[in-house]
C-alpha cells in the first residue's frame, strides 16, 4: 500500500528573466527513493539518480540547474515556461509518486509565491 505523500511548492509565479526553485518532498513512507525525474508536460527536464547522480536533458542544459537537494532550478525564465511541472519519485517498494507544480511566468514585477499544498 502506498502511504507516502508528496509536498510541493504548489502554485508559484515568477518574473520573466528571473529564476525559480522547484521543490518536492516525499514523506510518510519508509520506501527507498531510487530516482527523481523532473518533467514539464511530456518533456523530461532532468533526472537525479541515487547511484548515478544528475543528468540534465541536453536541450535544457543552459537554463536548468540541479538542486538544491533533489529540487530543480529554472533560470532565465520566459513566458513560454508557464505551465505544469512534475516531480516523479521512483521508490521501492511503493512504486511511483508524482507531485505537480504550476508555474506562471509574469511580465510584471508582481510575482507572488503561492501556498504549499499536498498531493496524496
Amino acid at each position: 500500500m502506498m502511504t507516502g505523500t508528496i509536498e510541493t511548492t504548489g502554485n508559484i509565479s515568477a518574473e520573466k528573466g528571473g529564476s525559480i526553485i522547484l521543490q518536492c518532498h516525499l514523506s510518510s513512507t519508509t520506501a527507498q527513493v531510487t530516482q527523481v525525474n523532473w518533467e514539464q508536460q511530456d518533456q523530461l527536464l532532468a533526472i537525479c539518480n541515487a547511484d548515478l547522480g544528475w543528468h540534465i536533458s541536453p536541450s535544457f542544459k543552459d537554463r536548468v540547474a540541479p538542486g538544491p537537494g533533489l529540487g530543480l532550478t529554472l533560470q532565465s525564465l520566459t513566458v513560454n515556461d508557464t505551465g505544469e511541472y512534475f516531480c516523479i519519485y521512483h521508490t521501492y517498494p511503493d512504486g511511483t509518486y508524482t507531485g505537480r507544480i504550476f508555474l506562471e511566468v509574469l511580465e510584471s514585477s508582481v510575482a507572488e509565491h503561492g501556498a504549499r499544498f499536498q498531493i496524496p
Epitope: Q32, V33, C48, A50, D51, L52, G53, W54, H55, A65, P66, G67, L70
Partner: antibody
C-alpha cells in the same frame, strides 16, 4: 564501523583473468551501491563502475566495459570484480569504495586496495 | 565525460605555510566536487564534498571553495601529517572522474 576488506595482492600472467573480492561489514550490504576504482602508477584514479547489491544492477565506465565484470554475493556481503584478458596496462591498485549515502555520490569509505601485477 | 584538471602537479612547502590546490572541470559541475587526501601506500580519504563541506573528523585548517568549473582546496598552517597526494573528483553525474593529483612534499 563501516569496513571494506579486499583480497590480497595478485601476480597474474598476460591473457589470464582474475577476480578481486571486497568484503563489507558494519552496515547493510544491500542498502548501498559498491564502486570500483583503479589507480595506476600510484597516481591516476579512474572509476571503473558500480553495482547495486540489492538487485545486481550495474553501471560501467565505457572504458572498462568488457574489461571488468562486477558481481556480488549477498549471503557473504561480498562484492567481486573480475578482470578479463589482462595486459600490462591492467597492472594497478584496485579499490572498492562506498558512497556516503543515497544521493550522496562521493566516496566516504574505501577498501585497502588490491595490487594486481600482470607479468609473464 | 567531464575532464578534471588539477594544478599544480607537485608542490613543496614547509610546516606552518598555507597552500592552495586548484581543480578545473571541463563543464559546469555546480558544487558537485569532492577532495581526497592519499598517503603513500594507503587508500584515499575523503576531505571535502559539495565543494566546501568538510567530512567528519577533518581539521578546520582544510577548506574547500568554488563552484561551476573552478575549485580550490586551501590548507592553512600545514602540519607534518598533511603531506601526501590530493585528488579532486566530480560527483555531478556518472562517469565519475578524478583530477590527476597534486603531490604535496615537505620543503
Amino acid at each position: 564501523e563501516v569496513k571494506l576488506v579486499e583480497s590480497g595482492p595478485e601476480l597474474v600472467k598476460p591473457g589470464a583473468s582474475m577476480k578481486i573480492s571486497c568484503k563489507a561489514s558494519g552496515y547493510s550490504f544491500t542498502g548501498y551501491t559498491m564502486n570500483w576504482v583503479k589507480q595506476s602508477h600510484g597516481k591516476n584514479l579512474e572509476w571503473i563502475g558500480l553495482i547495486n547489491p540489492y538487485n545486481g544492477g550495474t553501471s560501467y565506465n565505457q572504458k572498462f566495459k568488457g574489461k571488468a565484470t562486477l558481481t556480488v554475493d549477498k549471503s557473504s556481503s561480498t562484492a567481486y570484480m573480475e578482470l578479463l584478458s589482462l595486459t600490462s596496462e591492467d597492472s594497478a591498485v584496485y579499490y572498492c569504495a562506498r558512497y556516503a549515502n543515497r544521493f550522496e555520490n562521493w566516496f566516504a569509505y574505501w577498501g585497502q586496495g588490491t595490487l594486481v601485477t600482470v607479468s609473464s | 565525460d567531464i575532464q578534471m584538471t588539477q594544478s599544480p602537479a607537485s608542490l613543496s612547502a614547509s610546516v606552518g605555510e598555507t597552500v592552495t590546490i586548484t581543480c578545473r572541470a571541463s563543464e559546469n559541475i555546480y558544487s558537485y566536487l569532492a577532495w581526497y587526501q592519499q598517503k603513500q601506500g594507503k587508500s584515499p580519504q575523503l576531505l571535502v564534498y559539495n565543494a566546501k563541506t568538510l567530512a567528519e573528523g577533518v581539521p578546520s585548517r582544510f577548506s574547500g571553495s568554488g563552484s561551476g568549473t573552478q575549485f580550490s582546496l586551501k590548507i592553512n598552517s600545514l602540519q607534518p601529517e598533511d603531506f601526501g597526494s590530493y585528488y579532486c573528483q566530480h560527483h555531478y553525474g556518472t562517469p565519475w572522474t578524478f583530477g590527476g593529483g597534486t603531490k604535496l612534499e615537505i620543503k
